[in-house]
């Protein structure tokens, strides 16, 4: 079964720069699985933002604008990040990563 | 059937204003973030504002900033474009795009030209 | 931001034969952020191709995408009377939101 491991604890920037997150991938091949990522904001329900699948499609959140949240992997690290554009304040939260395994 | 009927084009004099409206059906307007994109006379495609379904992420392009303000209605299922101290180089086709999940603009308005005169 | 340039800027083809356009991205950008847009005269734009291997409902499987990193192609295997029309790449992974110059397909 597969495992994620997101090592940042925190991540502090400035407003209106970039935050990277990762989530590392184990026990199972990355390219052969779909990654979601999530927020939780303080006091709200968690919120679905982005996946890339197995293929490298991306889906994301609707009432998102593109090119707010970006996702990826990386095979070779067997790592997905998550790339939040143009931080603000509502930005602020906890990011989770998950994995459906194909 | 998803529709995006403009409205509000026209001709504007430089240093003017003018509000573009964008009527959505077919779909939970509520739910999705919408653009508005222009193309200049024989000109390509350019990408001037975005803003989320809930209106609390709004985007615009840099040759727009602190002129232009995008807004929506969902109550109305309407986006809007409010164009202020409007220049030569704003002269175009305005089209309102809707943003799917799979982040292209999916549906787009018919297109509704504004013409700046000085 | 990101800057995508197109080429050719005109392409002179005829009905049958095989269209190869161009779209270099300035920055390396993921393939799952790339799109692909056709315009005809006096009509709104229409997606294609998004990402690396979508294709638009009703979108015929002549029309393919591929490419990574800086290069991507657009490749129209035969060309049918209705595809002479200008087509747009489109970055939408990050803010803002960038389009090609375009390339015209017309007839030879």
């Known amino acids: 079964a597969g495992h994620l491991e997101q090592p940042q604890i925190s991540s502090t920037k400035t407003l209106s720069k970039t935050a990277r997150l990762e989530c590392v991938v184990s026990g199972i091949t990355i390219s052969a699985t779909s990654v979601y990522w999530y927020r939780e904001r303080p006091g709200e329900v968690i919120q679905f933002l982005v996946s890339i699948s197995y293929d490298g499609t991306v889906r994301k959140e609707s009432g998102i604008p593109s090119g707010k949240f970006e996702v990826d992997r990386i095979p070779e690290t067997s790592t997905s990040t998550l790339t939040i554009h143009n931080v603000e304040k509502q930005d602020i939260a906890t990011y989770y990563c998950a994995l459906w395994e194909v | 059937e998803v529709q995006l009927v403009q409205s509000g084009g026209g001709l504007v004099k430089s240093g003017g204003s003018l509000r573009l409206s964008c009527a959505a059906s077919?779909?939970?307007?509520?739910?999705?973030?919408m653009n508005w994109v222009r193309q200049a006379p024989g000109k390509g495609l350019e990408w001037v504002s975005s803003?989320?379904?809930?209106?609390?992420?709004?985007f615009y392009a840099d040759s727009v900033k602190g002129r232009i303000i995008i807004s929506r209605d969902n109550a109305k299922n309407s986006l809007y474009l409010q164009m202020n101290s409007v220049r030569a180089d704003d002269t175009a086709v305005y089209y309102c795009?809707?943003?799917?999940?799979?982040?292209?603009?999916?549906?787009w308005g018919q297109g509704t030209l504004v013409t700046v005169s000085s | 931001e990101i800057v995508l340039t197109q080429s050719p800027g005109t392409l002179s083809l005829s009905a049958g034969e095989r269209a190869t356009l161009s779209c270099r991205a300035s920055?390396?950008?993921?393939?799952?952020?790339l799109a692909w847009y056709q315009q005809k005269p006096g009509q709104a734009p229409r997606v294609l191709i998004y990402?690396?291997?979508g294709r638009a409902t009703g979108i015929p499987d002549r029309f393919r995408g591929s490419g990574s990193g800086t290069d991507f192609t657009l490749t129209i295997s035969r060309l049918e009377p209705e595809d002479f029309a200008v087509y747009y790449c489109?970055?939408?992974?990050?803010?803002?939101?960038?389009f090609g110059g375009g390339t015209k397909v017309e007839i030879k």
């Open positions: 795009a809707k943003d799917g999940e799979l982040g292209v603009f999916d549906y």
């Open positions: 489109q970055q939408f992974g990050r803010s803002p939101l960038t």
């Open positions: 920055q390396s950008i993921s393939s799952s952020y």
């Open positions: 077919g779909f939970t307007f509520s739910t999705y973030s």
């Open positions: 990402g690396p291997s």
């Open positions: 803003i989320s379904s809930s209106s609390s992420y709004i």
